[in-house]
């Protein structure tokens, strides 16, 4: 019967476990005339056989490590051996069993680490290989530190990345390792297959000797630099040093200042390049960075602190050209008239900005000089000798000297003598009645005019009226502006009215003077008035609880996962229907009742994160009013992008014949996120057959060197396949091709006869 084990000739794939003795046929192909026999070609390895009648079988156990996929072709032949059907591809996938143990590439590793190295930054890799399939647990390796010697206070100073074998310092190791105390450590590292999760896993161990070296990459002490220096610039102020020669130093201005007055040379000496002004900026914090020849940071940046020391280069300044104070006729001796507050831009709470006040002149000197005194340090003016009479002298002018330790400034004060404040403001009416307004009345609208009068001296603080709402507007929706000429009060809307929270408000106004009332006089009912504000309902759009809603999910969440939700309420209490707008990638859907947002397609951080869409809340029924808010979906990275070449490497060439083995450097990248330490790719040749001619060696986490192993290359193009592994979770591998041309050279460039100008290599090695 046709089915699982027999049928017509068509492309097929079969999976067979390695290591198992053959127990049954793979498939029986059925011939359609004129086909009478079958023929098997491809990677049979003398294991796979097809009988003339179409019976496909294998005759001995398979080994995945020899060949993981057998690409076979089956053709149906007629009686003359001519192909009449096919050939069709038959793929045999050899399934892995755990029949290989992991093996460290070295029985002993040696490495060194600087004290205070960044925790988690690898300084050494141990590497084991397991011939089993890395896509299955059989070939998934798990590294562990078995023992650390010496172990001080039971604290581990070293850690290993279970997946990559990268050895780095722990937080404690970064803080406590000290070559003066313990210059060397030994680690025993184990590697297990089966991801370390099975009792049946195979394992291997290796020994790692680690030397601790001193770290001189340390932040210098904070620097103090006097402002307005007249010395020739640049001036060296401090220095940093990387542990090894050849580092490239640079400064990073985190504050993005328009003028950054510091520089660093290639010795690590830091300079100030121009005089500083403390009053412009009193302190600088910037970073010194050391990078390798490829521009990769060698370690964490060092924070450089520069404090700018003050000199007394600023005189005191007056608060205004003339400062005006008022004093009532009957005020008592010692009463405060007002405080003159002068400023000094020099550093606060230092002698450079400490001010003294002194009255140097009073005009007129009637009825006598010295009517006023000023507190030397506080600047408060007081009545010194007697009460003043308005009809004698309505105005006094004082000249006041304000001084710091080096500079003197004159400030001018005008003191107006005013009538006593013995009259209270009186409202023209105590009840302004009812006022009905729609809740959507514009902010800034004047809704009512109120008026009180005061019989004291006009245009003084005794007769000026200030209106306050003392009751009925706890939300501060209303305010009162006063016309200084007429003392008319204009009641205005400062915040939106709201029928739903305050349909009726009983408002009480109080009218008062800025000057204090004379002793014995008090505000009474005449200084109070009321009115009733009635707010009518307007159908309003729904209101979202936030302007922007934010959610965070991993980019590999399953389709249908809830990724966030939004909430809105309708002021009138109507139901709300939610919808999405601007979902340009078609990733999301929203539950129109609950506001819950779900994924409906695979998400991709690399396409852009955060993903921004608009959410719309619409009233159900009523006027169908709607409002809009933002939903921002932050996508967290998963390792879903294999490494690739960072740029186009067409045009690499060596001059033929090679006089000595040559090399070239290439860079890898991938689109995943690499926080803190950047990518850590490992590089190997893409196929075993390349190993006689080529060698690839890692330079750092992103760069590798491709070298020739000999000089006997033909004059042609070679395509070198490179396998790049990102060591992520899960590890992803990319196979990239570097085309390298060996060509005759003229003056160091590839020679091409005329008419062969296409694709001229441009990079000579």
């Amino acid at each position: 019967q046709e089915g699982k084990f027999s049928g017509p000739l068509k492309p097929m794939t079969f999976s067979i476990y390695e290591g198992q003795e053959p127990s049954q046929i793979i498939f029986q192909f059925k011939a359609n005339p004129p086909a009478v026999t079958f023929e098997l070609t491809g990677e049979t390895d003398n294991i796979f056989v097809i009988e003339r009648e179409g019976l496909l079988y294998y005759n001995r156990a398979l080994d995945r490590e020899t060949r993981s996929t057998h690409n076979l072709q089956v053709a149906a032949l007629d009686a003359n051996g001519i192909i009449v059907e096919g050939p069709v591809p038959i793929t045999i996938k050899v399934k892995d069993i755990n029949d290989n143990r992991p093996t460290f590439l070295q029985s002993k590793y040696e490495g060194s680490v600087r004290q205070n190295s960044r925790p988690g930054k690898p300084f050494l890799y141990v590497n084991a290989t397991d011939l089993d399939d890395p896509a299955t647990p059989n070939g998934q390796l798990y590294y562990q530190i078995v023992i650390q010697l010496p172990m001080i206070n039971n604290v581990m100073y070293f850690q290993i990345n279970n997946k990559t074998g990268a050895i780095s310092l722990t937080r404690e190791g970064s803080q406590e390792l000290n070559p003066a105390k313990n210059p060397s450590y030994n680690l025993v590292i184990s590697v297990k297959d089966m991801g370390g999760q099975s009792e049946n896993s195979f394992s291997d161990t290796t020994s790692v000797d680690i030397i601790v070296t001193e770290n001189i990459w340390k932040a210098p002490k904070p620097v103090e630099m006097v402002e307005n220096s007249t010395d020739p610039h640049p001036i060296k102020i401090t220095q940093v040093r990387w542990n090894d020669p050849g580092a490239q130093y640079s400064l990073v201005d985190k504050e993005k200042l328009p003028r950054f007055p510091f520089s660093i040379d290639q010795e690590g000496d830091i300079y100030v390049t121009q005089p500083l002004d403390r009053e412009e900026k009193d302190a600088y914090v910037f970073y010194a960075v050391a990078k390798d020849e490829y521009g990769k940071p060698l370690s964490y940046p060092l924070e450089i602190h520069v404090k700018v020391k003050d000199i007394n280069d600023n005189p005191p300044t007056c608060p205004s050209p003339v400062t005006v104070f008022e004093v009532q006729e009957n005020e008592r001796l010692g009463n405060s008239i007002g405080t003159l507050t002068a400023h000094d831009r020099d550093e606060e709470n230092t002698a450079n900005s400490f001010l003294n006040y002194r009255i140097v002149e009073q005009t007129p000197k009637l009825p006598m000089d010295g009517l006023f005194l000023i507190q030397t340090y506080a600047g408060m003016l007081q009545l010194a000798k007697q009460s003043l009479k308005k009809q004698d002298t309505p105005q006094y002018n004082l000249t006041i000297e304000v001084s710091d330790k080096d500079f003197k400034t004159l400030c001018f004060v005008q003191i107006n003598v005013i009538d006593i404040n013995d009259q209270i403001p009186i409202f023209e009416k105590s009840d302004y009645g009812n006022l009905t307004l729609a809740e959507d009345t514009n902010i800034g609208s004047t809704i009512l005019t109120i008026q009180a009068t005061d019989a004291d001296e006009p245009f003084t603080g005794s007769s000026k009226i200030l209106y306050h709402i003392i009751k009925g507007d706890s939300e501060g929706r209303l305010g009162v502006d006063t016309d200084p000429h007429t003392n008319t009060g204009y009641v205005i809307i400062k915040k939106p009215l709201d029928f739903e929270t305050a349909a009726v408000s009983n408002i009480v106004f109080k009218a008062e003077n800025p000057e204090p009332l004379v002793f014995g006089v008090k505000y009474n009912a005449s200084s109070f008035a009321k009115f009733t504000l009635i707010v009518t309902d307007v159908n309003e759009a729904p209101q979202f609880s936030q302007h922007v809603f934010q959610a965070k999910v991993s980019e590999d969440v399953a389709i249908g996962t809830k990724v966030g939700n939004v909430t809105a309420k309708d002021p009138e209490g109507l139901d709300i229907s939610y919808s999405l707008r601007g979902d340009t990638r078609g990733w999301l859907k929203i539950d129109h009742v609950t506001g819950e947002i779900f994924s409906v397609a695979p998400l991709d951080r690399e396409a852009g994160s955060p993903y921004r869409v608009q959410v719309v809340a619409t009233e159900v029924g009523g006027s169908s009013l709607s409002s809009v808010s933002e939903f921002h979906l932050i996508l967290m990275d998963v390792n879903d992008n294999p490494p690739r070449l960072a740029k186009d490497y067409t045009g690499l060439f060596f001059c033929h014949p090679l006089s000595a083995p040559g090399s070239l450097i290439f860079e890898a990248t991938d689109d995943d996120q690499h926080l803190f330490r950047g990518p850590h790719f490992t590089f190997s040749l893409g196929s075993g057959s390349l190993q006689n001619d080529w060698e690839v060696s890692k330079i750092n986490g992103t760069h590798a060197r491709l070298s020739t192993r000999h000089t006997e290359f033909e004059e042609r193009e070679y395509v070198v396949l490179i396998r790049i592994n990102d060591g992520g979770r899960p590890p992803l591998e990319g196979i990239v091709s570097l085309p390298v041309t060996f060509c005759s050279c003229v003056e160091g460039s590839c020679f091409r006869p005329a008419g062969h100008q296409t694709g001229i290599p441009t990079v000579g090695m």
Partner: antibody
């Protein structure tokens, strides 16, 4: 010993038909394909077609479609070729040949040839 | 159809001379599908070399065959009188099967 015995020479008039036979002995008739090849005087060899007796399946060179009809009688282990609407162009020696039944495939045994003369 | 071109069409060789006949195929074929037949006057063709280089039963070892793709040859290392005959190449790659036009080899 494998032998392919062909019928004797034929002299026929233009427009007529003729049926040439090829009797196989010394091997299983149905296991092999029988091919027919034409050779005009002082000329090369031309493949006409073949028959696979087990199915009675035939395949002709497009050039001989409508001219040659191939049949076989399994009981007598004989293959036949009938040629229709004869003209002087059909005057030639016709060979039957047997193909091997497995790789390598080639004509391993040939009949002695049948001479056909078309003349009025 | 696949066309086979033989050269030379006619040649004469002295005893002991080395002889090479070539067969050019109009499109590339597998070497296992190129055969040579010998025909003497008044007799049926005989299989001579099959699969480019394998000698059929009873063929003297002075005969050899070689080639690949579109270019094939039959070689006699030392001509003898009995080798005088017409030699045909033939392709077994696709229908219709075709023969070369033949090379007539004579003794000088």
């Amino acid at each position: 010993q494998v032998q392919l015995q062909q019928s004797d020479a034929e002299l026929v008039k233009p427009g007529a038909s003729v049926k040439i036979s090829c009797k196989a002995s010394g091997s299983t008739f149905t296991d092999h394909t029988i091919h027919w090849v034409k050779q005009r005087p002082e000329q090369g060899l031309e493949w006409i077609g073949y028959i696979y007796p087990v199915y009675g399946y035939t395949q002709n060179n497009e050039k001989f479609k409508g001219k040659a009809t191939l049949t076989a009688d399994k009981s007598s282990s004989t293959a036949y070729m009938q040629l229709n609407s004869l003209t002087s162009e059909d005057s030639a020696v016709y060979f039957c040949a047997r193909s091997r039944d497995s790789n390598p495939y080639y004509f391993d045994y040939w009949g002695q040839g049948t001479t056909l003369t078309v003349s009025s | 159809e696949i066309v086979l071109t033989q050269s030379p069409a006619l040649m004469a060789a002295s005893p002991g001379e080395k002889v090479t006949i070539t067969c050019t195929v109009s499109s590339s074929i597998s070497s296992s599908n190129l055969h040579w037949y010998q025909q003497k006057s008044g007799t049926s063709p005989k299989p001579w070399i099959y699969g480019t280089s394998n000698l059929a039963s009873g063929v003297p070892v002075r005969f050899s065959g070689s080639g690949s793709g579109t270019s094939y040859s039959l070689t006699i290392s030392s001509m003898e009188a009995e080798d005088a005959a017409t030699y045909y190449c033939q392709q077994w790659s696709s229908y219709p099967f075709t023969f070369g036009s033949g090379t007539k080899l004579k003794m000088k």
